[in-house]
Amino acid sequence: APRGTQAEESPFVGNPGNITGARGLTGTLRCQLQVQGEPPEVHWLRDGQILELADSTQTQVPLGEDEQDDWIVVSQLRITSLQLSDTGQYQCLVFLGHQTFVSQPGYVGLEGLPYFLEEPEDRTVAANTPFNLSCQAQGPPEPVDLLWLQDAVPLATAPGHGPQRSLHVPGLNKTSSFSCEAHNAKGVTTSRTATITVLPQQPRNLHLVSRQPTELEVAWTPGLSGIYPLTHCTLQAVLSDDGMGIQAGEPDPPEEPLTSQASVPPHQLRLGSLHPHTPYHIRVACTSSQGPSSWTHWLPVETPEGVPLGPPENISATRNGSQAFVHWQEPRAPLQGTLLGYRLAYQGQDTPEVLMDIGLRQEVTLELQGDGSVSNLTVCVAAYTAAGDGPWSLPVPLEAWRPGEAQPVHQLVKEPSTPAFSWPWW
């Protein structure tokens, strides 16, 4: 650091004063010197280091007519919005010829009310769940003693006696406010007041109660909600997608989930209008007057298979002697599962019914017993899944086949009144 020489008398006739104040204060340090001839540029030092970007102004007043006469030089350093980094020892420095002169020092100090570096933040917490809040303040002057308050009531018997920088709260059952007071020799500063909103705990034990091809009944155990009763629970379901990766609970599914609200109690809900034999993921959250709990993890569930909702379509049945040729098309109505095959039944007027499992084929040739003289032969067809048989078609009479004629086709039943399946579904 530059040092003043003692070889000549110092040109300084006014040295910087002292400034002590609170953060944000604006003040000015002033140096005055008297020199002969060309006035030098005045530099400012803080703790021995030249301030390159100082907010300083220099005023020069000649004391005579001649340039070689004496000049009064005044340099003023302006400190705006005093901060901790501004504190220290200040001096003026000038170069006169081959000599360096440094003024007597002035001191800038920061002293005021405590200043918060960290204050408690608003947050939500689940009822009866531990959490931490932070508060940090500094002077000068030090020390700074903290006192935490909950709902404006001190949490310790005196400042500095309780938790200081971090407050551990073992759990809340009602929405509460927290703040901290910072005490030092100059006074007290109070932090912002943080509102800690108590939400219901995440529900537990989400599980299936019963399954139907198009509906699932689910139940769960509600978490604690403090002094606030639960108003409702919300269930979300989404069609499972192997690429979704929601088994672990994250991330949220890409498509819009299907949402249903349940009045509580009971903590149970029947989800209807689902696709049969379809994997879903479901989750639940419960809400009080303070807001919703966090969601449970996604639970994989699956609707069971059902029986086909309609009979096979467009059945044609023709007879040629002792042979009958029957063919049909897959039911138009929802299969509610994986089609495993078809069953066919035929019967004459006075003969017992013959039942056959055709498998997945959609046509069959029947070898009729006797000479084929059995009268009023009719055929019925039903589709089946692992859950059982769907409805049988209306009986189709076996008609004699005449060469050159098209085979007769029978519309079996009136169009079944099946429910429309479209999203959203409740």
Partner: antibody, heavy 113, light 107 residues
Framework: QVQLQESGPGLVKPSETLSLTCTVS????????WGWIRQPPGKGLEWIGY???????SYNPSLKSRVSISRDTSKNQFSLKLSSVTAADTAVYYC???????WGQGTLVTVSS | DIQMTQSPSSLSASVGDRVTITCRAS??????LRWYQQKPGKAPKLLIS???NLAAGVPSRFSGSGSGSDYTLTISSLQPEDFATYYC?????????FGQGTKVEIK
């Protein structure tokens, strides 16, 4: 530099009121809490009570019916009054900031006729 | 009131010794405990706050530990200036209560 200085009579007659004042320099009594502690000769420390920066008080229940702590913020002083004293109240009386970083040097008060 | 039981009431030790003083509260005081050193004719001096936090300017040979209702002040290597009386204080509840003191004397 923070300093606390107790002042008041060193001798009080039984049944009279003991009055002490603590003058604080270097620290505003409108911040923090300020208390009185006493120590009978050759014995341990006993907490008497405190006054908060806002002027509310807390007292040791064993003395509550006889004790009063007040303050004068314009003089940066707080005071202790203990009524109906007996010989058992003979002690060195200390004033302190309740964080106990800073104490007065203590003043011996003797209760005797 | 919370009772503070300090032990031992006195002990004799030599320079360089490790000294341990304990304080037991009649109920859980949740670390609201302070330790003081007092020399004859002087005001007490704060050593430890919050059961474990060393006060400014106190040598690191002093340390505090404990939780719940049991607390300990340890002087790792006793120095000549450490011969004094030591007090614990609970400030969890009003009235604040001191232990009866432990006098550390030169053996």
């Amino acid at each position: 530099q923070v300093q606390l200085q107790e002042s008041g009579p060193g001798l009080v007659k039984p049944s009279e009121t003991l009055s002490l004042t603590c003058t604080v320099s270097g620290y505003s009594i409108t911040s923090n809490y300020w208390g009185w502690i006493r120590q009978p000769p050759g014995k341990g420390l006993e907490w008497i009570g405190y006054i908060t920066y806002s002027g509310s008080t807390s007292y040791n229940p064993s003395l509550k019916s006889r004790v009063s702590i007040s303050r004068d913020t314009s003089k940066n002083q707080f005071s202790l009054k203990l009524s109906s004293v007996t010989a058992a109240d003979t002690a060195v009386y200390y004033c302190a900031i309740t964080t106990f970083y800073y104490w007065g040097q203590g003043t011996l008060v003797t209760v005797s006729s | 009131d919370i009772q503070m039981t300090q032990s031992p009431s006195s002990l004799s030790a030599s320079v360089g010794d490790r000294v341990t003083i304990t304080c037991r509260a009649s109920q859980d005081i949740g670390n609201y405990l302070r330790w003081y050193q007092q020399k004859p004719g002087k005001a007490p001096k704060l050593l430890i706050s919050g059961a474990t936090n060393l006060a400014a300017g106190v040598p690191s040979r002093f340390s505090g530990s404990g939780s719940g209702s049991d607390y300990t002040l340890t002087i790792s290597s006793l120095q000549p200036e450490d011969f004094a009386t030591y007090y614990c204080l609970q400030s969890k509840e009003s009235p604040w209560t001191f232990g009866q003191g432990t006098k550390v004397e030169i053996k």
